[in-house]
């Protein structure tokens, strides 16, 4: 069974930037790719990027950077300021689409113990 | 304009065979998933058979696994659908259709239709 | 497979109703539905995607809601030539699966 993969990490040097990466771990090859904050697109979450391997990438502030790093893993950095900026304990969601399998979604947070002056 | 156009249809005995065709023009077809749906006589739509833009997946109804086949030219901008030991079951109206990414894979276009008739 | 259950088969009402069709999922298919229209004599045509959202030109007393197992379909201020079939679809996981339809007649 198909799985996706989501990993929130805040950055060492702005507190509160962050970056998201999702991974899926299935057979299928990847149709689109949507991240949103605030829990799934549509179930009150709203979209921060969404990424088509051909058609290419359209992305929404806070995000600064989304990007392919493999055919079936994306990264999005988040900016760190303004009034929407992200905090600690905000809900990043991956939704990859796959056809025609279908869709496959999980979400993921800052883990709790994460201190960012660690992770330089 | 988007236009999708069935073709191949008609009267055909029990056990026999028919090869459907769909042209699309109006949009790059090589970029779009496609598929056929059948509308039975009770008016119920099903999905017989679905093929990514990239030719590697596949997707078939379980009643037509085995009998029917999807294919595409990419060149020809044309979709088929290659059914064999047709059966009663297998009467309905058949469409052709495209799948838009951004859409969550929602049907955007249909064609007109063509009509199977298996007869004994 | 998912099974998209869709309530009422029927309805009858007068021009300037407001209409609702609902569509109950068998699990959970996220927010990845669409909604169709079949006028008489002719093929299904997309009105609605990820639930809520209008395909061009549809007009916006059409309206869509839900997420998970339970959405809803709207028609505001019904008209004349909103007679048709109705069909809700899953596209969360294969097979996509429609909805049994609901045929709408006006008084």
């Known amino acids: 069974t198909p799985e996706v993969w989501v990993q929130v990490r805040m950055e060492a040097t702005e507190l509160s930037s962050f970056t998201i990466r999702c991974g899926f771990l299935g057979s299928g090859s990847i149709s689109l790719v949507t991240v949103s904050w605030g829990g799934p697109n549509g179930a009150g979450g709203t979209t921060l990027a969404v990424l088509h391997p051909e058609r290419g990438i359209r992305q929404w502030a806070p995000a600064r950077q989304a990007r392919w790093e493999t055919q079936s893993s994306i990264s999005l950095i988040l900016e760190g300021s303004g009034a929407s900026s992200p905090c600690a304990n905000t809900t990043f969601c991956c939704k990859f689409a796959s056809f025609p399998e279908g869709s496959w979604e999980a979400c993921g947070s800052l883990p709790p113990s994460s201190d960012p002056g660690l992770s330089a | 304009d988007v236009k999708l156009v069935e073709s191949g249809g008609g009267l055909v005995k029990l056990g026999g065979s028919l090869k459907l065709s769909c042209a699309a023009s109006?949009?790059?077809?090589?970029?779009?998933?496609m598929s056929w749906v059948r509308q039975t006589p009770e008016k119920r739509l099903e999905l017989v058979a679905a093929?990514?833009?990239?030719?590697?997946?596949?997707y078939y109804l379980d009643t037509v696994k085995g009998r029917f086949t999807i294919s595409r030219d990419n060149a020809k901008n044309t979709l088929y659908l290659q059914m064999s030991s047709l059966k009663s079951e297998d009467t309905a109206l058949y469409y052709c259709?495209?799948?838009?990414?951004?859409?969550?894979?929602?049907?955007?276009?249909w064609g007109q239709g063509t009509s199977v008739t298996v007869s004994s | 497979s998912i099974v998209m259950t869709q309530t009422p088969k029927f309805l009858l009402v007068s021009a300037g109703d407001r209409v609702t069709i609902t569509c109950k999922a068998s699990?959970?298919?996220?927010?990845?539905v669409a909604w169709y229209q079949q006028k008489p004599g002719q093929s299904p045509k997309l009105l609605m995607y990820?639930?809520?959202n209008r395909f061009t030109g549809v007009p916006d007393r059409f309206t869509g809601s839900g997420y998970g197992t339970d959405f809803t379909f709207t028609i505001n201020t019904v008209q004349a030539e909103d007679l048709a079939v109705y069909f809700c679809?899953?596209?969360?996981?294969?097979?996509?699966?429609f909805g049994g339809g609901t045929k709408l007649e006006i008084k």
């Open positions: 109006g949009f790059t077809f090589s970029s779009y998933h």
């Open positions: 990820y639930v809520s």
């Open positions: 093929i990514n833009s990239n030719v590697i997946s596949t």
């Open positions: 699990q959970s298919v996220s927010n990845d």
């Open positions: 679809q899953q596209a969360y996981r294969s097979p996509w699966t």
């Open positions: 259709a495209r799948h838009e990414d951004y859409y969550g894979f929602a049907m955007d276009y």
